[in-house]
């Protein structure tokens, strides 16, 4: 029969012969021959291959470097890479999560719209009229101004986006 020019799925062509690829988690030790099958070997410690392959070396698991603020979110296996995430208070600088930066704080006049996660930064929003934030924080939302009326008090000093209203006693009319 004619030597093949193309092979089935999960096979590869070598020396005019179709050989089985190694399954995920295993590397190639030797190609098949007319008389023998492909020889594969499982990846070793801290190594992986995540596809059917003919690689002679497995890939190293990603290292979650604590000096870059990283920690292991999911330990790798022979078929999967390690997944890193950031330490508490930090978030990834990219989708690959190769390093971390400190969560941004929202300045006075701004509140937290969305608290940061391991993969996304804090989202801030300006405090609208009727709300304020007087601290720089990665957690605090804008707080509503105090309602003087409900305390039987009057506004002595108007609030801003950074300060609360100042309430005071009602002026009593002298008889």
């Amino acid at each position: 029969p004619e030597p093949p020019t193309a092979c089935r799925e999960k096979q590869y062509l070598i020396n005019s012969q179709c050989c089985s690829l190694c399954q995920p988690g295993q590397k190639l030790v030797s190609d098949c021959t007319e008389f023998t099958e492909t020889e594969c070997l499982p990846c070793g410690e801290s190594e992986f291959l995540d596809t059917w392959n003919r690689e002679t070396h497995c890939h190293q698991h990603k290292y979650c470097d604590p000096n870059l603020g990283l920690r292991v979110q999911q330990k790798g296996t022979s078929e999967t890479d390690t997944i890193c995430t950031c330490e508490e208070g930090w978030h990834c600088t990219s989708e690959a999560c190769e390093s971390c930066v400190l969560h941004r704080s929202c300045s006075p006049g701004f509140g937290v719209k969305q608290i940061a996660t391991g993969v996304s930064d804090t989202i801030c929003e300006p405090c609208p009229v009727g709300f304020f934030s007087n601290v720089s924080s990665a957690f605090e939302k804008c707080h509503p101004w105090t309602s003087c009326e409900t305390k039987d008090l009057v506004v002595q000093q108007a609030g801003t986006n950074k300060t609360d209203v100042v309430c005071g006693p009602q002026d009593r009319l002298r008889a």
């Epitope: 988690g25 030797s30 008389f35 023998t36 099958e37 492909t38 594969c40 070793g44 410690e45 022979s78």
Partner: antibody, heavy 120, light 111 residues
Framework: EVQLLESGGGLVQPGGSLRLSCAAS????????MSWVRQAPGKGLEWVSA????????YYADSVKGRFTISRDNSKNTLYLQMNSLRAEDTAVYYC?????????????WGQGTLVTVSS | QSALTQPASVSGSPGQSITISCTGT?????????VSWYQQHPGKAPKLMIF???QRPSGVSNRFSGSKSGTTASLTISGLQAADEADYFC???????????FGGGTKLTVL
Amino acid sequence: EVQLLESGGGLVQPGGSLRLSCAASGFTFSRNAMSWVRQAPGKGLEWVSATGGSGISTYYADSVKGRFTISRDNSKNTLYLQMNSLRAEDTAVYYCARGYSNSWWYFDYWGQGTLVTVSS
Amino acid sequence: QSALTQPASVSGSPGQSITISCTGTSSDVGNYNLVSWYQQHPGKAPKLMIFEVNQRPSGVSNRFSGSKSGTTASLTISGLQAADEADYFCCSYTTSSTYVIFGGGTKLTVL
């Protein structure tokens, strides 16, 4: 029908040598990885050694590394285990086992075993 | 490398289901989907029942099934029969230089 027949076991003194053979039939011998697995009397199973279909790649358990040698002769459909510097703890039934296709860490057919006794 | 941990014995009545656990580490069961199970009747050679965690070789009854969660593999036998009474061994590839390790074995008694 797949058949594996071990031979070569027996009584040997500590420090002595033995060569086990496993005659295979009923399948294309060179297409399968092969292993030796042993079982001490009344104990569990222990993987000993394996070889790929070509015989080029060989693998050993730490407990036998440097003392045992696995080999195969594909023209004779035979697997071998040369055992040197034998110790009392090597006493066991030695099984020849066929690897499931090229995966020598699965054993889909086993021989009936040959008993190796290491004693003075 | 120490053996995988299996219960020494389990028992069940005919028709029941039983599960045998096999606990390893992140270096063996947890790292590889290369777990197999063997049945051994007294005085006989072992027989492959499950490979690659949950695959059954042809000729093995579908009453036998395998699974894995984290570092523990399990063999479940449903519709227990008298002929299932035997020793069962789990096995896994390992990152250690020993390559392959077995569990200590579980004696299954059908009451």
